[in-house]
Interface confidence: low
């Protein structure tokens, strides 16, 4: 009991438990298709725990399996314009380093206008992900609406 | 071509703003995937980048630098400001303009790639 | 923050020689590594960026190589007007960070 309760007291880096979740910050100009996050306690709730942003893209610190969450909402959206829109698509991959560049996530808004999804995936310091939203729509910056995040699950 | 130009006081007293403007010519502010960037050169010495700045309003600072610097756009005018304060003379230095330009290619590199001629700013009582 | 780490500081060469710089990054920056010429009194000019690739403008004289950690800035055929100050930049993480710089003088 005492060595769990001394546990607690180190940061989550040292335990190898990184982890963040982000809010949208804003989008890219016209034919830059990446979503620009941000986080940190001052934000509200969202923060970063080992992983770093670098120009609004989140880039991993510790080699290990995550669990990859993303939900985008887009902004003045209905089915119907979601549906007269298509293809509005969101794709999570990684971007850099160039000879790591695979896509991780595909999902096609269809006729909703929220998207959501979760996967587990192997990543690797240095690893960068990206996230692409292409199509007319905008995504909406409300916080309990778009939101990414990463979470270390094993090594 | 887009050129640009660092305007400003060339002397702060210690504990002051140090504050700088950077005017774009010969292109848009706005203009898409560009950052807008300042770094610093002491005298003698190498580069120390400060931060970058989206059109949109999107920053980032060096962390040695953060808690004393401001960096705005005022996309109207076509510029850009630097403000950082509690200065000492630590903070002498030729204060450049850059574009930071991000290369819309698979892994987003970037450079400075067109800066200004610099601006000496020295902090002296 | 990442190290960036120039040699020699400087060096004297004759026109014509052929002229390498080196750069050691103090961890991986896969090749974001750009390269600057500085003039006395000037402001840097962008030479190479992402490791190998010339700007536009530049004299392919000047070429860069190398990934990782290790990368190198070679000018072919030295001229009067490359007697400079180099330097290097990663742009792999924040803050971007420069090599203390290389100065290439006269013989």
């Known amino acids: 009991q005492r060595f769990a309760q001394a546990q607690q007291q180190l940061p989550l880096e040292s335990l190898g438990w990184d982890v963040a979740e982000l809010q949208l910050n804003h989008t890219g100009p016209q034919q830059d298709p990446r979503l620009y996050w941000q986080g940190g306690p001052a934000l509200g709730r969202s923060f970063l725990h080992g992983p770093e942003l670098d120009k609004g893209q989140l880039r991993i610190h510790r080699d290990g399996i995550y669990m990859v969450h993303i939900q985008v909402t887009l902004a003045i959206c209905s089915s119907t314009t979601a549906s007269r829109h298509h293809p509005t698509t969101l794709a999570v991959g990684i971007c850099s380093p160039a000879s790591r560049s695979i896509s991780l996530l595909r999902l096609s808004f269809h006729q909703g206008c929220t998207i959501a999804s979760q996967r587990l995936t192997p990543l690797a310091r240095g690893d960068t992900l990206c996230t692409n939203l292409t199509g007319t729509l905008l995504p909406s910056r409300n916080t309990d609406e778009t939101f990414f995040g990463v979470q270390w699950v094993r090594p | 071509q887009v050129q640009l130009q660092e305007s400003g006081p060339g002397l702060v007293k210690p504990s002051q703003t140090l504050s700088l403007t950077c005017t774009v010519s010969g292109g848009s502010i706005s203009s898409s995937s560009y950052y807008w960037g300042w770094i610093r050169q002491p005298p003698g010495k190498g580069l120390e980048w400060i931060g970058s700045i989206y059109h949109s309003g999107g920053t980032y600072f060096n962390p040695s630098l953060k808690s004393r610097v401001t960096i705005s756009v005022d996309t109207s005018k076509n510029q850009f400001s630097l403000k950082l304060s509690s200065v000492t003379a630590a903070d002498t230095a030729v204060y450049y303009c850059?574009?930071?330009?991000?290369?819309?290619?698979?892994?987003?590199?970037?450079?400075?790639?067109?800066w200004g001629q610099g601006t000496m700013v020295t902090v002296s009582s | 923050d990442i190290q960036m780490t120039q040699s020699p500081s400087s060096l004297s060469a004759s026109v014509g020689d052929r002229v390498t710089i080196t750069c050691r990054a103090s961890q991986s920056i896969s090749s974001y590594l750009n390269w600057y010429q500085q003039k006395p009194g000037k402001a840097p000019k962008l030479l190479i960026y992402a490791a190998s690739n010339l700007q536009s403008g530049v004299s392919s004289r000047f070429s860069g190589s190398g990934s990782g950690t290790d990368f190198t800035l070679t000018i072919s055929s030295l001229q009067p007007e490359d007697f400079a100050t180099y330097y290097c930049q990663q742009s792999f993480s924040s803050p971007r960070t420069f090599g203390q710089g290389t100065k290439v003088e006269i013989k």
């Open positions: 850059a574009r930071h330009y991000e290369i819309l290619t698979g892994y987003y590199p970037d450079v400075f790639d067109i």
